[in-house]
Amino acid sequence: KESCDVQLYIKRQSYHSIFAGDPFKLECPVKYCAHRPQVTWCKLNGTTCVKLEGRHTSWKQEKNLSFFILHFEPVLPSDNGSYRCSANFLSAIIESHSTTLYVTDVKSASERPSKDEMASRPWLLYS
């Protein structure tokens, strides 16, 4: 029997390598059965996840899954870091794994490095 718990499909240790100045959509895939839960995004600051208020968010519906999207328009160097989405469901909080944005400031990079280079070259990243 299929579980009717809310599930948030962000992979553990996932990351996105992106560039300052570009638009970017960070998606939180949400599986639910009857009522769509309230979902929020937060940004990790050490062990605390600070709720992101007043940001542009939207929902996208696909066949078996909904996506709660955090929009970066555009990406700023200060957007570098780890993010988590949370769902409020039956008075319980379900938290996703965190996903990390590695932001490269194109002004400081002579050419755009590959995704793997960026993930392994922390001196390109902003904290």
Epitope: Q7, L8, I10, K11, R12, Y15, E95, H97, S98, D116
Partner: antibody, heavy 119, light 112 residues
Framework: EVQLVESGGGLVQPGGSLKLSCATS????????IHWVRQASGKGLEWIGR????????KYAASFKGRATISADDSKNTAYLQLNSLKTEDTAVYYC????????????WGQGTLVTVSS | DIQMTQSPSSLSASVGDRVTITCRSS???????????LNWLQQKPGKAPKRLIY???KLDSGVPSRFSGSGSGTDFTLTISSLQPEDFATYYC?????????FGQGTKLEIK
């Protein structure tokens, strides 16, 4: 039925390259991380690296960085390991493993493929 | 890199025995989500490894309940409560909390 089937092993000359395939079925490869692990005869397991088939992001053990390339084609539900500049000490059984990325709900291993590096 | 040290390296035991294998990591395997990503694998000669336990203590589907895992931080244990003939194999711990992921050197469980 869940399956991971490696292929592409065999005899390779020192200095040569190999490309191994890992064909998966019974689950959506995009929901997983694909790992490549090797085992020399009579020895333990050695982690080579990991690929996220959903976006291509890859991590490698330091000793394989620059020599190994792990990739996946989610349309074929297949992952790949390319290893260059082969040495005799790369002789081993190479395994792919698929671990569910969200809730750790499964961790499947292929049967392995033997690579022999010899002149 | 995190070193994973298993003990003992080999072990002779009889059917029905209770067996304990330990795995010590050189640093904590506690991730920032509060979980330790420690797996136990079983490998029989000429066969692929098979995951038995994940997240320290969760049993994979179809794994007999005589297998159990415990521990936290840096010290972890695999226990087989009553050895069966099919349990004679090599067991590996594997951490996937920190990159690069690392394995213990293995514990070979043999029939006494």
């Amino acid at each position: 039925e869940v399956q991971l089937v490696e292929s592409g092993g065999g005899l390779v000359q020192p200095g040569g390259s190999l490309k191994l395939s890992c064909a998966t079925s019974g689950f959506n490869i995009k929901d997983t991380y694909i790992h490549w692990v090797r085992q020399a005869s009579g020895k333990g397991l050695e982690w080579i690296g990991r690929n996220d088939p959903a976006n291509g992001n890859t991590k490698y053990a330091a000793s394989f960085k620059g020599r190994a390339t792990i990739s996946a084609d989610d349309s074929k539900n297949t992952a790949y390991l390319q290893l260059n500049s082969l040495k005799t000490e790369d002789t081993a059984v190479y395994y792919c493993a698929s671990y569910e990325g969200y809730y750790e709900r499964f961790g499947y291993w292929g049967q392995g493929t033997l690579v022999t590096v010899s002149s | 890199d995190i070193q994973m040290t298993q003990s003992p390296s080999s072990l002779s035991a009889s059917v029905g025995d209770r067996v304990t294998i330990t795995c010590r990591s050189s640093q904590s395997l506690l991730d920032r989500d509060g979980k330790s990503y420690l797996n136990w694998l079983q490998q029989k000669p000429g066969k692929a490894p098979k995951r038995l336990i994940y997240l320290v203590s969760k049993l994979d589907s179809g794994v007999p309940s005589r297998f159990s895992g415990s521990g936290s931080g840096t010290d972890f244990t695999l226990t087989i409560s009553s050895l069966q003939p099919e349990d004679f194999a090599t067991y590996y711990c594997w951490q996937d909390t920190h990159f690069p992921y690392t394995f213990g050197q293995g514990t070979k469980l043999e029939i006494k």
